[in-house]
């Protein structure tokens, strides 16, 4: 009788748009059919998926974050069959272009400025801010109490993913008007 199979991988943490991953269904057995499923479904037709080695090896080329799914292999012969436990692929990606919220760019003097930066990334990225090119704290949220027109300028959020070796950033212009002189928003 066939044993419960297992899945081995040549790359446990592939990087999006860069790496390939080869899953192999163990053990190797003669006169055995090897089958694969992704998230409980049969393999989709895709030029990035390739079966080889008598269907025992499943290769994903140029992995994307959408490939971070549960992979299962099965083995079957004329007298028995069995399926592996699922193996979930951990795809490293990002950081994507960050988003600064709220989207407001005009503020009244005396308001609190509370900017949050978010970037899709696995693992979570490191965040840092620069105001008019000057480095600020390494936090996801930038808070400045009671802003004045002196706080006018460009606010840049920088994100870095050490696992993928990639960086990204976005710049936002902030205008602070003296109280009562602008219809700008008050935070």
């Amino acid at each position: 009788e066939l044993p419960k199979p297992s899945i081995s991988s040549n790359n446990s943490k592939p990087v999006e748009d860069k790496d390939a991953v080869a899953f192999t269904c163990e053990p190797e057995a003669q006169n055995t059919t090897y089958l694969w499923w992704v998230n409980g479904q049969s393999l989709p037709v895709s030029p990035r998926l390739q079966l080889s080695n008598g269907n025992r090896t499943l290769t994903l080329f140029n992995v994307t974050r959408n490939d971070a799914r549960a992979y299962v292999c099965g083995i079957q012969n004329s007298v028995s069959a069995n399926r592996s436990d699922p193996v979930t692929l951990d795809v490293l990606y990002g950081p994507d272009t960050p988003i600064i919220s709220p989207p407001d760019s005009s503020y009244l003097s005396g308001a609190n400025l509370n900017l949050s930066c978010h970037s899709a990334s696995n693992p979570s990225p490191q965040y840092s801010w620069r105001i008019n090119g000057i480095p600020q704290q390494h936090t996801q949220v930038l808070f400045i109490a009671k802003i004045t027109p002196n706080n006018n300028g460009t606010y840049a959020c920088f994100v870095s993913n050490l696992a993928t070796g990639r960086n990204n950033s976005i710049v936002k212009s902030i205008t602070v008007s003296a109280s009562g002189t602008s219809p700008g928003l008050s935070a």
Partner: nanobody, 120 residues
């Protein structure tokens, strides 16, 4: 030894209903697909329906899908085939089977079969 034990077959009039059951002797079947094949006199054995390990179902034809319903118990070791609106052409020996992707690959595990006869 692995065993699949079927029950529920019999003689029924056209338009009637039957419920087939198939119990597996081992818990490893929770990781396998279970389903039903049938063989009419003088014909080859054909796939009817299956319940996959992941909770999906597959049916041979739309005609079967509209009249038959396959289901599985929570332990995934017993499979049922509820057959409604039976027709004379449904007369066959119905076999329970277990394996991987039953509709595409010949399964390794088979029951002994249960006779279903639709006749007035």
């Amino acid at each position: 030894e692995v065993q699949l034990v079927e029950s529920g077959g019999g003689l029924v009039q056209p338009g009637g209903s039957l419920r087939l059951s198939c119990a597996a002797s081992r818990g490893t079947f929770s990781r396998l697909d279970m389903g039903w094949f049938r063989q009419a006199p003088g014909k080859e054995r054909e796939f009817v329906a299956s319940s996959t390990w992941s909770g999906g179902t597959a049916y041979a034809t739309d005609s079967v899908k509209t009249r038959f319903t396959i289901s599985r118990d929570s332990a995934k070791t017993t499979v049922y085939l509820q057959m409604n609106s039976l027709r004379p052409e449904d007369t066959a020996v119905y076999y329970c089977a277990a394996g991987l992707s039953l509709e595409q690959h010949t399964p390794p595990y088979w029951g002994q079969g249960t006779q279903v006869t639709v006749s007035s």
